[in-house]
């Protein structure tokens, strides 16, 4: 059920029809904030951005690929398995786990056109979902009926 | 079922480079679990969707615009200011702030071109950031130096 | 085929509370949104709201937030709405509707349940 | 919110008629416009959707056409299956509204 007619042209199809400028708007990370001082730490700060004083603390990993828009990802890594104490920032609570937050998400990738005769008539846009990890949440875990 | 029209080229820009194909790949909203029973109670369920499990629950509220790409976007409410008690599921302990995390995505809206002569010629895409809330985190609160 | 099976016919006292359920069969629920409408008198239709039963996203009407709260079971492929503290205004027939998606972009409601007919007196 | 509005509650034509149906918006809705029938019995089926294209299974006879603020539903040549209420429905912006209905009798 197309609402929006094709963008690669198909045959017989205008290729000025459907344009995408390849712009540079920038696509900041998840996380607007400083990143965490100490990464790798399982620590629940008192400052610093979200994700670093989250009890279910994650660090951001880059993922880029310039054939695709956006062409940086962010991908959330748990720094920590279980939740930690809210009361030290420290200590491991065995009650919470730390889990992923996933979502799929819409970008478009950068692939050769190819017109009637199956010539190369530039670029195409192809959308495409792409699963990526958004942030840690600190839960409890699942009690199995 | 065509609603959106034809995108056009900006002045001297090459209409065969970017081209956008419309493919049918479905875009699933943010969690793709089962949706909290009870969406609007401050509590930690031990069994569905991780937004219900959270310590920082949190529902989806439905944010439609038909002429941006994806239509459809979910931004996350908390249930709780703060955080729920591991322990308990339900008391909330003030020593935890139940924190929106915060995300600008990039969307596509629909708008019409302008021919060469101010004419109008189809629709465009015009690329932008949208902020969307991903998510509630259970933090420790921030202390002020 | 697509179908939505309303639970039936209610007779309820003002002030109670209760829950219709609409039952989908014939497509993947979770792919397609829910809404629900109301209609007084055998005539006006209004939109009450929407959920996704993917992650229980919702959108409801102003007039009906906090009169109607919906939800979904995915297990059973079942949408339901609850109408609160209910008073004669609330005398209507209520319909579930499925909403066409073609992946990308939402239509129209495509495929109606028979409608549920709530009596407050 | 976007009023719909169906200024002709009922009307009255004969088998094999041509007839028309109308609706207006308060605001444009570029081309986000739904038509629906409802039977007698309260079965609602959708006719058309995105103003003229026909959902699946809907007889020929059936057509929309419209753009901004005004839109119409006509029945080329009328059927007695075809008496019912016909409601427009815009989704152009939550929330969705419906206009008040047009009952189609038979003369």
């Known amino acids: 059920y197309s609402h929006w007619p094709s963008c690669c042209p198909s045959k017989g199809q205008d290729t000025s029809e459907e344009l995408l400028r390849w712009s540079t708007v920038p696509v900041p990370p998840l996380e607007p904030a400083r990143p965490n001082r100490h990464p790798e730490s399982c620590r629940a700060s008192e400052d610093g951005p979200l994700n670093s004083r989250a009890i279910s603390p994650w660090r951001y990993e880059l993922d880029r690929d310039l054939n695709r828009l956006p062409q940086d990802l962010y991908h959330a890594r748990c720094l920590c398995p279980h939740c930690v104490s809210l009361q030290t920032g420290s200590h491991m609570d065995p009650r919470g786990n730390s889990e992923l937050l996933y979502h799929n998400q819409t970008v478009f990738y950068r692939r050769p056109c190819h017109g009637e005769k199956g010539t190369h008539k530039g670029y195409c846009l192809e959308r495409r979902l792409y699963r990526v990890s958004l942030a840690c949440v600190c839960v409890r875990p699942r009690v199995m009926g | 079922y065509s609603h959106w029209p034809s995108c056009c080229p900006s002045k001297g820009q090459d209409t065969s480079e970017e081209l956008l194909r419309w493919s049918t790949v479905p875009v699933p909203p943010l969690e793709p679990a089962r949706p909290n029973r009870h969406p609007e109670s401050c509590r930690a369920s031990e069994d569905g969707p991780l937004n219900s499990r959270a310590i920082s629950p949190w529902r989806y509220e439905l944010d439609r615009d038909l002429n941006r790409l994806p239509q459809d976007l979910y931004h996350a409410r908390c249930l709780c200011p703060h955080c729920v008690s591991l322990q308990t599921g339900s008391h909330m302990d003030p020593r935890g702030n139940s924190e929106l995390l915060y995300h600008n995505q990039t969307v596509f809206y629909r708008r019409p071109c302008h021919g060469e002569k101010g004419t109008h010629k189809g629709y465009c895409l015009e690329r932008r950031l949208y902020r969307v809330s991903l998510a509630c985190v259970c933090v420790r609160p921030r202390v002020m130096g | 085929e697509v179908q939505l099976q309303q639970s039936g016919p209610e007779l309820v006292k003002p002030g109670a509370s209760m829950k219709i359920s609409c039952k989908a069969s014939g497509y993947s629920f979770t792919d397609y949104t829910m809404n629900w409408v109301k209609q007084s008198h055998g005539k006006n239709l209004e939109w009450i709201g929407l959920?996704?039963?993917?992650?229980?996203?919702?959108s409801y009407n102003q007039n009906f937030k906090g009169k109607a709260t919906l939800t979904v079971d995915k297990s059973s492929s079942t949408a339901y709405m609850e109408l609160l503290s209910l008073t004669s205004e609330d005398s209507a027939v209520y319909y579930c509707?499925?909403?066409?998606?073609?992946?990308?972009?939402?239509?129209?409601?495509?495929?109606w349940g028979q409608g549920t007919s709530v009596t407050v007196s | 919110d976007i009023q719909m509005t169906q200024t002709t509650s009922s009307l009255s034509a004969s088998l094999g008629d041509r007839v028309t149906i109308s609706c207006s918006a308060s605001q444009g809705i570029s081309n986000y416009l739904n038509w629906y029938q409802q039977k007698a019995d309260g079965t609602v089926e959708l006719l058309i959707y995105y103003t003229s294209s026909l959902h699946s299974g809907v007889p020929s006879r059936f057509s929309g056409s419209g753009s901004g603020t005004d839109y119409s539903l006509t029945i080329s040549n009328l059927e007695p299956e075809d008496i019912a209420t016909y409601y427009c429905?815009?989704?152009?912006?939550?929330?969705?509204?419906f206009g008040g209905g047009t009952k189609l009798e038979i003369k």
């Open positions: 429905q815009q989704y152009s912006k939550l929330p969705y509204t």
């Open positions: 959920i996704n039963p993917y992650n229980g996203g919702t």
């Open positions: 509707a499925r909403e066409g998606y073609d992946g990308y972009l939402y239509f129209a409601m495509d495929y």
